[in-house]
Interface confidence: medium
Amino acid sequence: SGTTNTVAAYNLTWKSTNFKTILEWEPKPVNQVYTVQISTKSGDWKSKCFYTTDTECDLTDEIVKDVKQTYLARVFSYPAGNVESTGSAGEPLYENSPEFTPYLETNLGQPTIQSFEQVGTKVNVTVEDERTLVRRNNTFLSLRDVFGKDLIYTLYYWKSSSSGKKTAKTNTNEFLIDVDKGENYCFSVQAVIPSRTVNRKSTDSPVECMGQEKGEFREI
């Protein structure tokens, strides 16, 4: 059903990183516009991105209200310039998105090494606790605030002079590793949620090496 000059949206896809969440779809509109609605399983539909010619809609503000809820979105198609027009069934064409549970599915953003500090044969590597758009009491929560102990970081480190990598894991944002005295090391970290079935790992952080700006070195 639907009007003769509109086509239903298709390929509805959730794109979400650290809870910044955008719904994308096709096709690029020709003589039509779109409106998006989002709802939890038990909630009412809320309209967003009214009569847009875009093929994406930022739904972050809705999903961050409760990242453990499961959300469903739908995209309505309307004839351009005649948005009151409906299909033969009495409502505009629409297509449903897949269900989306942000806590289980949002991609983990690329982490950043905040600092590293060498004290003798130990190096303390600190991962930046990235801010998300999830709020509590008017404060933006960090990734660690949201995921708690479900989130770990994996550190990859190696001597600048060789390619053999070692790994360490932490469920805080800090690593304390043993290094050989007098050697320079390079570091990269990855955020991981081990118990997820999808989107378990982030991409690796940019590599940081000792002897460059970011670190501090103290010989004991």
Epitope: S42, K68, Q69, T101, D150, K169, I193, S195, R196
Partner: antibody, heavy 118, light 107 residues
Framework: EVQLVQSGAEVKKPGASVKVSCKAS????????MNWVRQAPGQGLEWMGE????????TYNQKFKARVTMTVDQSTSTVYMELSSLRSEDTAVYYC???????????WGQGTTVTVSS | SIVMTQSPDSLAVSLGERATINCKAS??????IAWYQQKPGQSPKLLIY???NRYTGVPDRFSGSGYGTDFTLTISSLQAEDVAVYYC?????????FGGGTKVEIK
């Protein structure tokens, strides 16, 4: 297939200790927290604590903190729960349970009956 | 710690009829609620997590709803194999706590 296999039934005297094991298989052992939950005869479920098999770090219910110790042996994918200074009210079935992402317990061991009797 | 109060303590429902179990938290737990089924002599089995998400392999006659402090588990059409004790559990704030259980029987 995920499996949690617990050690057999134990009968203990008041004041003694008991150590219950839970051997995991069929998944990445270090990727999931392991919890211990007990159930007294005819009663409900009571959470005792959890252990991170990757680090060995544990969090205990305040009620049991002075008497419970949870440990891990990564080489055998086994977690242990030791409860000391046993009393008759510790008679219960003790379960290990794997904590899924976000908190719920998705897989449970078959349970170990511990009877405390003089 | 958060206290979970289940009602009723027991429930007798005819085969094919709807069974409804309630769970109330002493403070808001958002949607951090799980529901478990325990049959006699067996370990508990996870049915619902995040208040309304069915766990893998759970029949769709089981559904969960609620948010904040009040939650419901519904069995839309009771089957003989559903006879069990059902527990709610909050996984919002440690220590994780369970309701006292609701025994579901056939009328």
């Amino acid at each position: 297939e995920v499996q949690l296999v617990q050690s057999g039934a134990e009968v203990k005297k008041p004041g003694a200790s008991v150590k219950v094991s839970c051997k995991a298989s069929g998944y990445s052992f270090t990727g999931y927290y392991m919890n211990w939950v007990r159930q007294a005869p005819g009663q409900g479920l009571e959470w005792m604590g959890e252990i991170n098999p990757s680090t060995g770090g544990s969090t205990y219910n305040q009620k049991f903190k002075a008497r419970v110790t949870m440990t891990v042996d990564q080489s055998t994918s086994t977690v242990y729960m030791e409860l000391s200074s046993l009393r008759s009210e510790d008679t219960a079935v003790y379960y290990c349970a794997r904590r899924e992402l976000g908190g719920p317990f998705g897989y449970w061991g078959q349970g170990t009956t511990v009877t405390v009797s003089s | 710690s958060i206290v979970m109060t289940q009602s009723p303590d027991s429930l007798a429902v005819s085969l094919g009829e709807r069974a409804t179990i309630n769970c109330k938290a002493s403070q808001s737990v958002s949607n951090g609620i799980a529901w478990y089924q325990q049959k006699p002599g067996q370990s508990p089995k996870l049915l619902i997590y995040f208040a309304s998400n069915r766990y893998t392999g759970v029949p769709d006659r089981f559904s969960g709803s609620g948010y904040g402090t009040d939650f419901t588990l519904t069995i839309s059409s009771l089957q003989a194999e559903d006879v069990a004790v059902y527990y709610c559990q909050q996984d919002y704030s440690s220590p994780w706590t369970f309701g006292g259980g609701t025994k579901v029987e056939i009328k």
